[in-house]
């Protein structure tokens, strides 16, 4: 400590206190003298900026008195004891109970000694995150939704994807006076490479220990895409049977799997076996051009492919995949 | 207006006591804080303690502790100052003196008349 | 205990300006020592002038101010008027006491 005349009190208290709407909330308020200085105090104020007048004071004779007695009161100060702590403690905090306090010791010989402190009324918001289901439009548009209910101040909400995307936010009054509610939309143009995928919707707020993270699964309607899978350009006569699969992809799911030719009906030597087409071994060369249509609820779509059966050694050859 | 009022005159014998008052008037006196001063003849002032009236909490200078003791009777709004234990050389004029407040800092306000206290054998 | 000195005497001319000060000797005056003046006019009793460095009693004219200036306390008569002819005593806090000034007596001549 400073020696003798030099040392002062002073008033420690946070610059800021936050509290939440609704509850309690304690402004802290301490004296501290130096080691060997004597000092006295007489009364602890409470005062908001801008009004007149205090809304809590504590009088060394007289104990306490409040502006609001059902929403103030002294936590530590007692008659009859040395008054260091002017800590306040404010129950039912509203939104207007935001704002400047200042806390103030009358102290003898040194005089007022005060401290102001910030009032932060919070309000913890309730965040969900859900998919916009789209159909392929060819234009942007809202693919996820993001809602941040009833915080003060606003959430901040981002969006985080490998995808690209735009975020459209906007702002509106919470059910509670002085409450935001903050809705994210994530924008995109829909594409059948995006559905099942993931976007996070990151929402920041005061009252959170860490951001909160809420994934969702995007969810692209398209009809199906087709191809043909199974043939290589190398079947020959006298081989064993080789499979054809029609590939779809769609959301929803196919509901059915149609495989014809140009030419009309599946010859003999072709079975349907839903998705896949049974190849049997055929004694000729063949050269047909094979369709596969497949449906879902938004539509049809087809995919051709011309398969040849030559004649040749087959030992010489990669030949039809066998079973 | 505020005032302090002070006893008579003291003649004490060393090894004595003795016991002044000083009335106070105008102001409240359970929020006041008082001091005892003295001056000594051909001698400066010298503080002596103070008093918290409204709980009798005190303050003495070092140099008195043991001898003096302060007191307030807040029913007639008089602080008192007891000297034990008398020499000659605290013959001197004994002030209290209120402690006014301006909102920031404290001041010697208000002043008692002395009483004059003599030690003598 | 600390030795608090001030000017024996002073004189200042009607109208004119004067400053008093207040040395400690266990070192620089500060805003901790909380410098009192208080005035002693012949025949009355004191009266107390400037508390907490700077801060003017009430009713106290405004050609009195406090400060400090240096290492020391200072009382500036702005203007002297003969009424304030007086014995000026600066006191100092020392964390758990006060100590007076041996005084100034200042003349208006």
């Known amino acids: 400590w400073p020696p003798p005349g030099t040392g002062d009190v002073v008033v420690q208290a946070p610059t800021q206190v936050p509290g939440f709407l609704g509850d309690s909330v304690t402004l802290p308020c301490y004296l501290q003298v130096p080691n060997m200085e004597v000092t006295h105090v007489s009364q602890l104020t409470w005062a908001r900026h801008g009004e007149s007048g205090s809304m809590a004071v504590f009088h060394q004779t007289q104990g306490p008195s409040y502006s609001e007695s059902k929403r103030l009161e002294f936590v530590a100060a007692r008659l009859g004891a040395e008054l260091r702590n002017a800590s306040l403690r404010m129950f039912g905090l509203r939104v207007e109970d935001e704002g400047n306090y200042t806390c103030l010791f009358v102290t003898f010989p040194q005089g007022s000694r005060s401290v102001d402190i910030w009032l932060r009324v919070l309000a913890k918001p309730q965040n969900t995150a859900e998919v916009q289901k789209v159909q392929l439009t060819g234009e942007p548009v809202p693919m996820a939704r993001c809602v941040s209910t009833g915080g003060r101040p606003p959430a901040q909400i981002t969006w985080h994807s490998d995808l690209g995307g735009m975020p459209n936010t906007s702002q509106v009054p919470g059910f509670l006076s002085g409450t935001v509610t903050v809705t994210s939309l994530w924008i995109l143009v829909p594409s059948s490479q995006v559905d099942g995928k993931n976007v996070t919707c990151k929402v920041e707020h005061e009252s959170f220990e860490k951001p909160q993270l809420l994934t969702v699964n995007l969810t692209v309607y398209y009809p199906p895409e087709v191809s043909i899978s199974g043939y290589d350009n190398n079947w020959y006569l006298g081989q064993n049977e080789a499979t054809l699969t029609c590939d779809a992809r769609s959301n929803p799911e196919p509901t059915g799997y149609n495989w014809s030719t140009t030419m009309g009906p599946l010859p003999p030597f072709a079975v349907a076996q839903g998705a896949q087409l049974l190849i049997r071994p055929v004694d000729k060369p063949i050269n047909t051009t094979l369709i596969c249509n497949v449906t879902n609820a938004l539509g049809a779509r087809q995919a051709e492919l011309t398969v040849q059966v030559k004649e040749g050694p087959p030992s010489e050859h990669s030949g039809i995949s066998r079973n | 207006q505020v005032q302090l009022v002070q006893s008579g005159a003291e003649v004490k014998k060393p090894g004595a006591s003795v016991k002044v008052s000083c009335k106070a008037s105008g102001y409240t006196f359970t929020s006041s804080y008082i001091s005892w001063v003295r001056q000594a003849p051909g001698q400066g002032l010298e503080w002596i303690a103070w008093?918290?009236?409204?709980?009798?909490?005190?303050n003495y200078n070092q140099k008195f502790t043991g001898r003096v003791t302060m007191t307030t009777d807040t029913s007639t709004s008089t602080a008192y100052m007891e000297l034990r234990s008398l020499r000659s050389d605290d013959t001197a004029v004994y002030y209290c003196?209120?402690?006014?407040?301006?909102?920031?800092?404290?001041?010697?306000?208000?002043w008692g008349q002395g009483t004059t206290v003599t030690v003598s054998s | 205990q600390a030795v608090v000195t001030q000017e024996p005497s002073l004189t200042v001319s009607p109208g004119g300006t004067v400053t008093l000060t207040c040395r400690s000797s266990?070192?620089?005056?500060?805003?901790?020592?909380?410098a009192n003046w208080v005035q002693q006019k012949p025949g009355q009793a004191f009266r107390g002038l400037i508390g907490g460095t700077n801060n003017r009693a009430p009713g106290v004219p405004a050609r009195f101010s406090g400060s400090l200036l240096g290492d020391k306390a200072a009382l500036t008569l702005s203007g002297a008027q003969p009424e304030d002819e007086a014995e000026y005593y600066c006191i100092l806090w020392y964390s758990n006491h006060f100590v007076f000034g041996g005084g100034t007596k200042l003349t208006v001549l």
């Open positions: 266990t070192g620089a005056v500060t805003t901790s020592n909380y």
């Open positions: 003196a209120r402690h006014g407040y301006t909102g920031r800092g404290w001041y010697f306000a208000v």
């Open positions: 008093i918290y009236a409204g709980t009798g909490d005190t």
